[in-house]
């Protein structure tokens, strides 16, 4: 029996009364909810929600709707010894100090519980000495640096803007290059945007603002103290010094007033170029060290947070599947946040709940999807992805047999331009289905399909008449679907105009302003975007837990893999001396790519013509897809990374919220020419090359006639 | 060079209104707060209320809320204050201040006008 | 509402003396501090604003100190023109709170 047989809404109005149900006035009361007090993972005020969305979700009309609980290392400001950073003098007085918490935006003077900006994971400690200034902590800033300006970052305190990557990444180059201690600032270049007022009247960074954020390089692993398994009642801890990922040094971030104060003194080197320049007005010297007047000045960290092993809670909802029971679709967003979470996450968990809602309505009527759809709350996302890999970890035998696709839902809006969609290229052809199905909220773009504008205000570059669709990297709950187990993932929310607006994120990203008032006054007052991603999250759910045939192209694969081997192949040949002197061949990976193309192009023949009424060859082809992303999966993960085990795509390892792809290859090249053992370099470049090309054969082979 | 000049100020009876303003110049008015501050006989400064830019924001003493009113003309670079039902203890010279944003320091400041209320 | 609390209410000093004037916050006021100087008939002019940061045209014999609850400013040599009355403000939250004025006057 299909699960169309079994509701009694006929099957072509299945998707159109799931998206009809769907209401903006609904997300904008669900985000005043969510966002009235603080939500920090690890605190009572959060678990009182998880226990809130659990009630509603069943009232909703979920089948069941569980809380999983983890115990695992976080990490908070001391209350009663707050963090700062200070200039001293030669006599160690303090003769400058850094705000201790943001000013309060109005109408929440009197909230309590509002963590103070921290840099979540920071070990203790209060080094003093000399200033650097190292831009963006880039890979590249640090080769700027230490190579081409011979300035040694040993021993000194470097202060870098935030922007361009993620914060860890920033941590983890500093500590590389020596330095005792990290500031992390926001520049107004990277978190204002000219021609628009500071919060409470507009959407940009006021001075006393600060990011908060994990400075963790967990690759994966989800709780430092329980690395591959799930850190539940009986589980073994590993010592804090053997932890994944905690960064060794102090680190804490502080907004615009501070940092002028701690940059208008520097002297040393003169920025290397303009690049270098933010838009305070200092000179943004290097350093190291104050200017002449001030050279016997110093800084000072003041670092107190402790790493706590606490209790956290995922809420799980499911929606029994009426056929295939055993397969699952997941829908899942965080629910903690830093302070308010105005946007990051409310905006997402306002839409999950929107959409829950609506399949309870459809659910409440009798009908079922096809198969099992999961609703996941997570919880410490903002901790390092906790929740949501400490679940998949508990989950993995499951998840790795039956995980038929994850949508990640954080933050549904950070601006209001466009859409943006990350995905594995197994979705394309359902995002470009389903968006020329819906109404574009755009204005001037009135009866026209959101594909339509999409597509006009974010082209493909590769190809025309299409709209971009991005790599998935990380620093978000799908990673451990997607990086670690190879499940068919995607995310989708509405956009900036990344050509007008060069600033990182959105400028109120993880302050205290992140507010209910931020999205309703300035972001989204209708609530028209948020409704349009509910109906494209929502709607890719709703195809993929419905439609008989999994909506998965595998040819879009197939062209995916030509063009990131053709572009790690022109990296490569930057180096066509070394690769003749070592014999480096990319032949085997484009031979690869090639019968995938082929075995791909034939699979998509036979989905055609197939009996779709024997359930038995039906559930046979559908198996191929779900297990096609599997099967990019390497057991051994990438070199130091084991838990990143996609061969065609990680997240980079300069950024964590980018993706590369062929990543075990890209990062065997990477700055080969400074390796001290060439040999050793180029092997490890073959090595990587056989890899990535006998799983891209093994992949193919799993879409071949399976006799 | 930064101007703000106040006027309206006067004796007005306890119960009666008056109508303040503030003309500004020497700078764009629309993109900055302001505010009035007012200053009793022998007495230390006390925040009466400010406006943000384009006057969709408001924010006043709580005790004052109910019968002062604060506006801006930006087309005609003017503050205004409207208060009502006055009383013996609105007597004070009022200020006029500029500021730069919701958390900024008030930089700038007009010459004052005198309010006294009396019967 | 935020009360804030300067010492000494008065004091009497000779030009060229260096010169503290404290001011107290009854909660956390984070860095969100003005100054402000008056002189008798006049309007008050700012000083320093964000507890250090100099407001243009002040000279920097005067520097302002402190975060948190208690905050210093200090006229390191006094000058004639510095005989006034001094004020703080805090910015941190609504309602805008002055302290109740520091009169500095010649000894």
């Known amino acids: 029996k299909s699960s169309n047989e079994a509701t009694n809404i006929t099957p072509k109005h299945n998707m159109k009364a799931f998206l009809d149900e769907l209401k903006a006035e609904n997300i904008k009361k669900f985000l005043y909810n969510f966002t009235q007090i603080p939500h920090l993972a690890g605190t009572e005020q959060n678990f009182q929600l998880a226990k809130q969305i659990q009630s509603q979700w069943k009232e909703f009309g979920l089948d069941s709707v569980e809380l999983a609980h983890y115990d695992v290392l976080l990490s908070y400001p001391n209350k009663t010894h707050p963090n700062y950073i200070s200039i001293i003098n030669e006599d160690g007085n303090e003769i400058f100090n850094t705000s201790l918490f943001e000013p309060p935006p109005p109408g929440y003077e009197n909230v309590s519980d509002i963590v103070p900006p921290f840099s979540a994971f920071s070990p203790q400690g209060m080094p003093e000495g000399d200033l650097v200034y190292v831009n963006y902590a880039r890979t590249e800033d640090f080769f700027k640096l230490e190579r081409d300006m011979k300035i040694n970052c040993s021993g000194k305190i470097v202060i870098a803007r935030y922007g361009k990557v993620f914060r860890g990444n920033k941590v983890k180059n500093a500590q590389l290059a020596g330095a005792k201690g990290v500031i992390l600032y926001s520049d107004p270049a990277d978190y204002f945007a000219p021609g628009v007022k500071s919060y409470p009247d507009g959407w940009n960074l006021p001075g006393g603002g600060v990011q908060r954020g994990n400075i963790l390089n967990l690759n994966g692993a989800g709780d430092p103290l329980t690395p591959g398994y799930p850190a539940n009642e009986y589980a073994y801890r590993r010592g804090i010094a053997e932890a994944v990922g905690l960064p060794s040094i102090p680190v804490h971030p502080i907004g615009y007033y501070d940092a002028q104060k701690l940059l208008e003194k520097m002297g040393g080197s003169a920025p290397p170029d303009s690049s270098w320049r933010g838009s305070l007005k200092v000179p943004y010297n290097v350093g190291p060290g104050f200017t002449g007047n001030f050279s016997t000045q110093k800084v000072k960290m003041h670092i107190h947070s402790t790493n706590e092993v606490t209790r956290i809670y995922n809420v799980i909802g499911t929606l029994r599947g009426a056929v295939e029971p055993d397969r699952y679709v997941i829908l899942g967003g965080h629910r903690d946040s830093w302070v308010f979470g105005g946007i990051d996450p409310q905006s997402g968990a306002a839409v999950v709940h929107e959409i829950v809602r609506s399949f309870g309505t459809l659910k409440k009527e009798g009908w079922r999807p096809r198969r099992t759809i999961l609703f996941a709350s997570w919880d410490a996302e903002e901790f390092g992805l906790l929740g949501s890999t400490e679940w998949a970890e508990e989950n993995s035998r499951l998840l790795q047999e039956r995980g038929v696709a994850y949508i990640n839902a954080d933050s549904s809006i950070e601006g209001n331009y466009t859409l943006r969609v990350d995905c594995t290229p197994l979705m394309y052809s359902l995002v470009h289905n389903l968006t020329k199905e819906l109404k574009s909220p755009d204005e001037g773009f009135e009866g026209k399909s959101l594909y339509e504008s999409w597509t006009k205000k974010s082209p493909s570059p590769e190809f025309s008449g299409m709209p971009r669709i991005s790599k998935l990297g990380s620093g978000n709950d799908f990673e451990v679907f997607f990086q670690r187990l190879g499940i068919a993932s995607g995310r989708a929310r509405y956009t900036k105009n990344w050509e007008t607006n060069k600033f990182s994120g959105y400028p109120l990203y993880h302050s205290v302003y992140e507010t209910y008032e931020l999205v309703e006054k300035f972001y989204d007052p209708m609530f028209k975007y948020h409704l349009t991603v509910a109906q494209v999250r929502g709607g890719m759910v709703f195809e993929l837990a419905n439609s008989i045939v999994l909506p998965f192209d595998c040819r879009d694969y197939a062209v995916v893999l030509r063009k990131y081997a053709d572009k790690i192949y022109s990296i490569s040949m930057k180096h066509p001396q070394e690769m003749k002197t070592y014999s480096v061949s990319f032949d085997s990976l484009f031979s690869a790519v090639k019968n995938f193309t082929e075995i791909a192009s034939k699979f998509s023949e036979r989905l055609q013509d197939f009996d779709k009424s024997n359930p038995i060859v039906l559930r046979m082809m559908n198996d191929q897809l779900m297990f096609l992303e599997r099967a990019f999966i390497d057991p051994l993960g990438l070199p130091d990374r084991p838990f990143y085990r996609h061969v065609i795509y990680a997240p980079s390892s300069h950024n964590k919220y980018a993706g590369e792809s062929f990543p075990g290859i890209y990062d065997a090249l990477f700055d080969i020419e400074s390796k001290v053992d060439p040999s050793k370099a180029w092997g490890e470049v073959k090595r990587q090359i056989y890899v990535a090309a006998f799983t891209v054969q093994a992949a193919a082979e799993t879409l071949s006639e399976v006799a | 060079e930064v101007q703000l000049v106040e006027s309206g100020g006067g004796l007005v009876q306890p119960g009666g209104s008056l109508r303040l303003s503030c003309a500004a110049s020497g700078f764009t008015f629309s993109d900055y707060y302001m505010a009035w501050v007012r200053q009793a006989p022998g007495k230390g400064l006390e925040w009466v209320a400010n406006?943000?830019?384009?006057?969709?924001?408001?924010y006043y003493l709580d005790s004052l809320k109910s019968r002062f009113t604060i506006s801006r003309d930006n087309a005609k670079n003017s503050l205004y204050l409207q208060m009502n039902s006055l009383r013996a203890e609105d007597t004070a010279v009022y200020y006029c201040?500029?500021?730069?944003?919701?958390?900024?320091?008030?930089?700038?400041w007009g010459q004052g006008t005198t309010v006294t209320v009396s019967s | 509402d935020i009360q804030m609390t300067q010492s000494p209410s008065s004091l009497s000093a000779s030009v060229g003396d260096r010169v503290t004037i404290t001011c107290r916050a009854s909660q956390d006021i984070s860095k969100y501090l003005n100054w402000y100087q008056q002189k008798p008939g006049k309007a008050p002019k700012l000083l320093i604003y964000?507890?250090?940061s100099l407001h243009s045209g002040v000279p920097s014999r005067f520097s302002g100190s402190g975060s948190g609850t208690d905050f210093t400013l200090t006229i390191s040599s006094l000058q004639p023109e510095d005989f006034a009355t001094y004020y703080c403000?805090?910015?941190?939250?609504?309602?805008?709170?002055f302290g109740g004025g520091t009169k500095v006057e010649i000894k």
């Open positions: 964000y507890t250090s």
């Open positions: 406006i943000n830019y384009d006057g969709s924001s408001t």
């Open positions: 403000q805090q910015g941190n939250r609504l309602p805008r709170t």
């Open positions: 201040a500029r500021g730069g944003d919701y958390w900024d320091a008030m930089d700038y």
